[in-house]
Interface confidence: low
């Protein structure tokens, strides 16, 4: 019988008492085979974290800063359940730390030196740790003691709870630096009042502060937010302009064998029986003998944290950066106006080889980071382990949902001003053998299909989106008799045709021979009935243009396209016989790296782009013997996006809508995790 006990960690006598009450009340409402509570008492949260890591306890609820500690080795804990606030209809699990300024003040985030600052209190998250952590590397040296460095950075501050004797500048705007509401500039509302009264130039608070203090929109319009990309936005655009997105209060557990499903089941039942307004005899979100015991008193319920979400992703890049800066106190030696090397994310062995070669040729401008799947790469870019990669439109969508931005687009047509003119896109097509003359778009059921990979544009999102509209279900593996769609579940019929050996079978990388455009076409040539690829794939792999043994004798005339009206056309007539127009592949990065990635990639393509005439002796960025490594092999240049600089604008409304519809069928654990942070 599996042990269905969750050992909750309590950090005080009062918490232990509430825990015992929690245990007893849960026993009375849960069947004997359901989850149960046991209580473990420790002296501090850090002791609880260590106890959970050592398998002496299973769960504890922590503030964001402690979630960071819990995640660090050797603890390796992960968030499993989040408290939420507000209503069930619009649950808030995060708050946003923001920098508020008056509208007419005219400076940006990178011009805060010498300004006057208002803080909620020394050592508090939104008011101190996050802004000072993010500004840490701009502070004058020596940066220790931190209070002195901050005092020397701003021309005056109000930082309640600071030592006014040792650091008088931190109390200049609020004499005495009182650490309670007796100080009119203490806390969220106090820091905002400090700005409102004109004492300070910037207030570091949370996103709701301005709404709680100014009910009138006209009054709120006198203020703006400073964004990390050195722009400003209106105060209601905090989701796109904040210093960090911070989880409020989170249950953590072990990453391996952490009972996360059991913890969720326990807490979900607990909130059913003892949540807000549920029971008189025991209340989960109430602390008669103290405040915020086990859970925050202000919480309204729990939400399950998606399993793909580790602590780094949950806390977010900005928050982790701020806290790490404060804790580790290390800053890069390079001056901040100079770009650090761009860490390119390479998929599997083949891309890594090409990336390493690029790195050597770039003389240190490019570094390489490896991952096994595109989603793993996106996650690494999110958390700062990597900086950039070029993605198919389907993954640009996921990356965008995860907060990344497109920075340059691959262009596939030669033109005089290639770098200035991003193209409208390429065509997604369905290719069949000419000899299979009875095959049409309308009778694909039961046939063998070849896809570039699950989640990619031409190979999956467009054809499966069209198919979904027709069949109204997600059982694509039943619609086709078998196929190869790398990234499918290994036991799926859509892995049956794949050719990868052992663990590489059906993997969404080049270790699977039928991966990508060329791989999907090869799958058609050797085993399949239909391949979903781009309009250039057939000409690029026929007529001797691909020297590989399977391709060298192929003739374009032996293949035809399926049109949506049930007819067929020759391959060269793709403009009148395609499934949809697909957005070109694009390079994505984090917002904070956008300018540097743009600058370095433009330098790199001038050195190694399509102007290099001899790729047999020189490194060519856009060549890899039809394997599309790092970039598509038919890339002519990387083009500026101009105003199409968000994933929605880049992909276009129609494609975003199509992928949105297909999300019903999505198996992307990363997309699930990212929509938890930003629904």
């Amino acid at each position: 019988v599996p042990d269905k006990t969750v050992r909750w960690c309590a950090v005080s006598e009062h918490e232990a008492t509430k825990c015992q009450s929690f245990r007893d009340h849960m026993k009375s409402v849960i069947p004997s085979d359901g989850p149960s509570v046991a209580c473990v008492k420790k002296a501090s949260y850090l002791d609880c974290i260590r106890a959970i890591a050592a398998n002496e306890a299973d769960a504890v609820t922590l503030d964001a800063g402690l979630v960071y500690d819990a995640y660090l080795a050797p603890n390796n804990l992960k968030p499993v359940v989040a408290e939420f606030y507000g209503s069930k209809e619009d649950p808030q699990t995060f708050y946003y730390a923001v920098a508020v300024v008056k509208k007419d003040s005219g400076f940006q985030m990178n011009q805060l030196r010498g300004k006057k600052s208002c803080h909620t209190g020394l050592g508090r998250s939104a008011g101190w740790n996050i802004p000072i952590g993010l500004l840490y590397c701009d502070l004058p040296e020596p940066r220790k003691p931190l209070e002195k460095a901050v005092a020397n950075f701003f021309s005056g501050s109000c930082a309640p709870c600071a030592d006014g004797t040792d650091f008088p500048q931190l109390c200049q705007l609020c004499p005495g630096c009182g650490c309670s509401t007796l100080n009119q500039y203490f806390g969220y509302s106090g820091a905002f009042k400090c700005l409102k009264d004109g004492a300070g130039d910037v207030a570091f608070v949370k996103h709701s502060t301005i709404f709680e203090n100014l009910a009138n929109k006209a009054d709120r319009d006198q203020y703006e937010l400073l964004c990390l990309d050195n722009t400003r936005k209106p105060v209601d655009e905090y989701k796109d302009c904040h210093l960090a997105q911070v989880p409020s209060h989170t249950v953590v557990a072990r990453s391996m064998g952490g009972k996360e499903d059991l913890i969720w089941e326990l807490l979900n039942q607990a909130q059913e029986h003892f949540g807000k307004d549920k029971s008189k005899e025991f209340q989960l979100f109430s602390s008669p003998h103290g405040k915020d015991l086990l859970f925050k008193d202000s919480a309204h319920g729990f939400l399950k944290v998606p399993p793909r979400m580790d602590a780094k992703m949950y806390l977010g890049y900005e928050y982790v950066t701020a806290i790490r800066n404060l804790r580790e106190g290390t800053c890069p030696e390079a001056p901040t106006d100079e770009c650090k090397p761009v860490k390119w994310c390479a998929l599997s062995h083949h891309e890594r080889l090409k990336c390493d070669e690029w790195s050597v040729n770039s003389v240190g401008k490019i570094e390489c980071v490896s991952a096994e799947t595109t989603e793993d790469c996106i996650a690494k870019i999110m958390n700062g382990e990597a900086d950039a990669m070029s993605l198919d439109g389907g993954f640009v969508y996921i990356a965008g949902k995860c907060g990344l931005v497109p920075v340059l687009a691959e262009n596939y047509n030669k033109s005089d001003n290639c770098e200035d003119t991003p193209e409208a896109g390429y065509f997604a097509i369905a290719v069949v053998k000419k000899s299979a003359s009875d095959l049409t778009w309308d009778n694909l059921k039961g046939k063998k299909s070849c896809h570039t990979a699950v989640g990619r544009t031409a190979g999956w999102n467009i054809p499966m989106g069209l198919l979904y509209n027709k069949i109204n279900h997600c059982r694509f593996d039943e619609f086709f008799s078998e196929g190869c769609a790398p990234g499918s579940k290994k036991d799926s019929s859509l892995c049956k045709l794949c050719m990868g050996s052992g663990l590489n079978l059906c993997e969404p990388n080049n270790k699977e021979g039928y991966y990508g455009y060329t791989g999907a076409f090869r799958c058609l040539v050797e085993k399949g009935d239909v391949a979903f690829v781009k309009h250039q794939t057939v000409p690029q792999n026929t007529g001797g243009k691909n020297p590989d043994p399977w391709a060298k004798n192929l003739n374009e005339k032996d293949y035809e396209l399926l049109c949506l009206d049930g007819t067929r056309k020759p391959v060269e007539e793709y403009a009148n016989c395609h499934l949809a127009r697909a957005p070109n592949h694009a390079v994505v990065t984090r917002k904070d790296k956008e300018a540097c990635v743009h600058k370095i990639l433009r330098q790199q393509q001038h050195l190694f782009g399509s102007n290099v005439t001899d790729c047999s002796g020189n490194f060519c960025l856009f060549r890899s013997e039809t394997k599309d490594l790092l970039f598509r092999d038919d890339t002519v240049c990387l083009a500026k996006l101009h105003d199409r600089n968000t994933y929605e604008k880049y992909l276009g409304e129609e494609y975003v809508k199509a992928v949105g519809n297909l999300r019903k069928c999505s198996t992307s654990s990363l997309l699930e995790a990212c929509t938890f942070r930003r629904p």
Epitope: G34, K88, F302, L303, K304, P306
Partner: nanobody
């Protein structure tokens, strides 16, 4: 495609019993919320009884506690609702529902919005 097929509805006298069945197909059974909702004419759809499949917990609306019992047969991917001591006010269309994926993020397992797969419904009529 995930499908839910209900059976077992019908007409019964007040105080009598009925047993509803709901079979799920097209997905890996276990680790999801599945259960019964009902909608009487002119009223909103309400949660009746739900369980966490694969041997998990059960949840009941206050109005049916002690009278209705939800259970499952893992091997058959089927959830049952045993309805005893039926009352006139139990008359409604009864729907089987399953919450897959992110639907589980809702706070209450008896909240209809948490469910993204629904059966066609089976009518239960209780007369005096």
């Amino acid at each position: 495609e995930v499908q839910l097929v209900e059976s077992g509805g019908g007409s019964v006298q007040a105080g009598g019993s009925l047993r509803l069945s709901c079979r799920a197909s097209g997905h890996a059974y276990g680790g999801n919320y599945m259960g019964w909702f009902r909608q009487a004419p002119g009223k909103e759809r309400e949660g009746v009884a739900v369980l966490y499949t694969g041997g998990g917990s059960t949840y009941y609306a206050d109005s049916v506690k002690g009278r209705f019992t939800i259970s499952e047969d893992n091997a058959k991917n089927t959830v049952y609702l045993q309805m005893d001591s039926l009352k006139l006010e139990d008359t409604a269309m009864y729907y089987c529902a399953l919450a897959l994926g992110s639907a589980r993020w809702y706070t209450s397992s008896l909240d209809a919005r948490a469910y993204n797969i629904w059966g066609q419904g089976t009518q239960v009529t209780v007369s005096s």
